[in-house]
């Protein structure tokens, strides 16, 4: 066959779908690789062809669109499964071509089994809710396009294994689940099951997401430097190891980049000749507030090093702060020498 622009296997789009549920998969060519959409391609006389490679096989084969009840079908740039079966797992390819043009991309499709409590190997999206922030909602994801707006599906929400119908701060409102007040106890996996009719059959869509309750922007503050502080003096003799921790608390802020760094005499440690190492550790609270610790270490400190200015800096979307460490050289203890004047010469 003639040359075809092959975009390879698009592993960025690792598509996972539940067994025995409808799945609609758009050809990624139009979404991520080509500068035109399906309608433009179709009106230009291009044809979209689908084929697949079964799991653990090398042989590419056409997709059987003549299964009973049209279990697999294609509609425009969408491949439909009504419903999926476990052995539909494999790599799927969509190819756009005519006599002079060809472009194709493959993507993996994994059909996943779930248990009665919706546990599965499915990778779950995470939705962050602010703690005690007023009404917040999660929305049943990825259900657009499965049924027309004239169809009114039934939606049932679950937290873990339990149907949500008498939870004391959560109201199911169709495709939305409203949290009147989000608390740590609301952390967990939430599942919506959407049930709709189609051509005399009933289909179910199961969507699970993880809710993580995080610090509220109402409570967010600029970074707080706990160490160094005015109460601790780093007093060292030349030759000793100097260890100064910089410990900074950051309120949780959505999409904020938290930074901590040291300066020595106003310069970054990389820009000076001292043999200094910096080790960082990060810990998080239950609401994803962050504590970063950067330990500045000079193995054998010199008297010159003990005269330098060591400043810890911190920055978040809420602001920037800095704090100097109190470093000084230990004063040697005075030696008391007793001089005995004996044997004064007398003539």
């Amino acid at each position: 066959s003639e040359r075809c622009d092959d975009w390879g296997l698009d592993t960025m789009r690792q598509i996972q779908v539940f067994e025995d549920e409808p799945a609609r998969i758009k050809c990624p060519l139009f979404e991520h690789f080509l500068k035109f959409n399906y309608s433009t391609a179709h009106s230009a006389g291009l044809t979209l062809i689908w084929y697949w490679t079964r799991q653990d096989r090398d042989l590419e084969e056409p997709i059987n669109f003549r299964l009973p009840e049209n279990r697999i079908s294609k509609e425009k740039d969408v491949l439909w499964f009504r419903p999926t079966l476990l052995n539909d797992t494999g790599n799927y390819t969509c190819m756009l071509r005519n006599t002079t043009y060809c472009s194709k991309v493959a993507f993996p499709l994994e059909v996943v089994q779930k248990d009665s409590c919706f546990n599965s190997p499915m990778k779950l999206p995470v939705h962050k809710l602010y703690i005690e922030y007023g009404i917040q909602r999660i929305t049943c994801p990825n259900v657009d396009g499965y049924f027309p707006s004239s169809v009114k599906p039934t939606i049932t929400w679950y937290m873990g294994c339990y149907k949500i119908q008498n939870f004391n701060n959560v109201i199911p409102e169709g495709m939305n689940l409203s949290f009147l007040i989000a608390l740590i106890s609301n952390n967990g996996n939430y599942t919506c099951v959407v049930t709709y009719p189609e051509n005399g059959r009933t289909f179910h869509l199961t969507r699970t997401l993880t809710v993580k309750v995080v610090g509220s922007p109402k409570n967010a503050v600029p970074p707080v430097i706990h160490s160094p502080n005015d109460h601790v003096v780093y007093e060292k003799e030349p030759g000793e190891e100097l260890l100064i921790p910089c410990t900074v608390y950051f309120s949780f802020l959505m999409d904020s980049r938290n930074e901590v760094w040291w300066t020595i005499d106003g310069k970054k440690p990389d820009d000076i000749t001292i043999d200094v190492t910096i080790n960082e550790s990060i810990s998080h609270s239950r609401t994803e507030d962050e504590t970063r610790t950067q330990i500045l270490s000079i193995k054998k400190v010199t008297s010159e090093d003990l005269k330098r200015s060591y400043v810890c800096h911190a920055r978040s979307a809420k602001g920037e702060v800095a704090k100097a460490a109190k470093v000084k050289q230990k004063v040697p203890a005075p030696r008391y020498t007793v001089e005995l004047a004996c044997g004064f010469g007398a003539t």
Epitope: I131, E132, G134, I135, Q136, R137, Q165, N166, F167, N168, N169, V170, I171, P172, E173, G174, S178, L180, I181, L183
Partner: antibody, heavy 120, light 113 residues
């Protein structure tokens, strides 16, 4: 046995203020509940006023007509209070305190109510 | 804001008969509706929540149905003790103004003959 008792009702002058207290016995607010107030004018239907969540920082929701004149707060682990200002004759009603185990519609425990009469 | 409209009122029924009370919400409240029974001089009593879930200790002759904007309370095999006023209570949220709307219907008086 779990119980709610309202107090603080009585005769009040128009434009006056009052504080109604709801006291819980047999349980405390250390478990998180919605504590709510509902009123009923003589011979009329029920009217929701407000609810407070007894956990966390005490989020409160009010009926739109109640915003501004009514203030609901948790004053201890067993009491919530409803402060009402600028009273008019239309506020004459029996005020019920109710507990919601569920969300804010399933009031499964009610007090007997306290009558507030606004008259000169 | 949410408004709940109850019909009919009053309604009368013979002992052993069936009573149906309707409640209509001014907007979609999904299944977020409760039914209460109130007798003179008493506080209301919860019968049904989440539109169709029977509250603890409530006789099975009471049942609730509906979702969205139309709801029904049915009393099958009415007893004389069921003479009371019945209220629906709906709830919905408005995230744009961070508010919860709770609204009672006007009440339906049930007279048992």
């Amino acid at each position: 046995q779990e119980q709610l008792v309202e107090s603080g009702g009585g005769l009040v002058q128009p434009e006056g203020s009052l504080t109604l207290t709801c006291t819980a016995s047999g349980f405390s607010f250390s478990s998180n509940y919605w504590m709510c107030w509902v009123r009923q004018a003589p011979g009329k239907g029920l009217e929701w006023i407000a609810c407070i969540y007894t956990g966390g920082s005490g989020v409160t929701y009010y009926a739109s007509w109640a915003k501004g004149r009514f203030t609901l707060s948790k004053t201890s682990s067993t009491t919530v209070t409803l402060q009402v200002t600028s009273l008019t004759a239309a506020d004459t009603a029996t005020y019920f305190c109710a507990r919601d185990l569920v969300v804010v519609t399933s009031f499964n425990l009610w007090g007997q109510g306290t009558l507030v009469t606004v008259s000169s | 804001a949410l408004m709940m409209t109850q019909t009919p009122s009053p309604v009368s029924a013979a002992v052993g008969g069936t009573v149906t009370i309707n409640c209509q919400a001014s907007e979609d409240i999904y299944s977020n509706l409760a039914w209460y029974q109130q007798k003179p001089g008493q506080p209301p009593k919860l019968l049904i929540y989440s539109a169709s879930t029977l509250a603890s200790g409530v006789p099975s002759r009471f049942s609730g149905s509906g979702s969205g904007t139309e709801f029904t309370l049915t009393i099958s095999g009415v007893q004389s003790d069921d003479a009371a006023t019945y209220y629906c209570l709906g709830v919905c949220t408005d995230i744009s103004v961070d508010d919860v709307y709770n609204s009672f219907g006007g009440g339906t008086e049930v007279v048992v003959k």
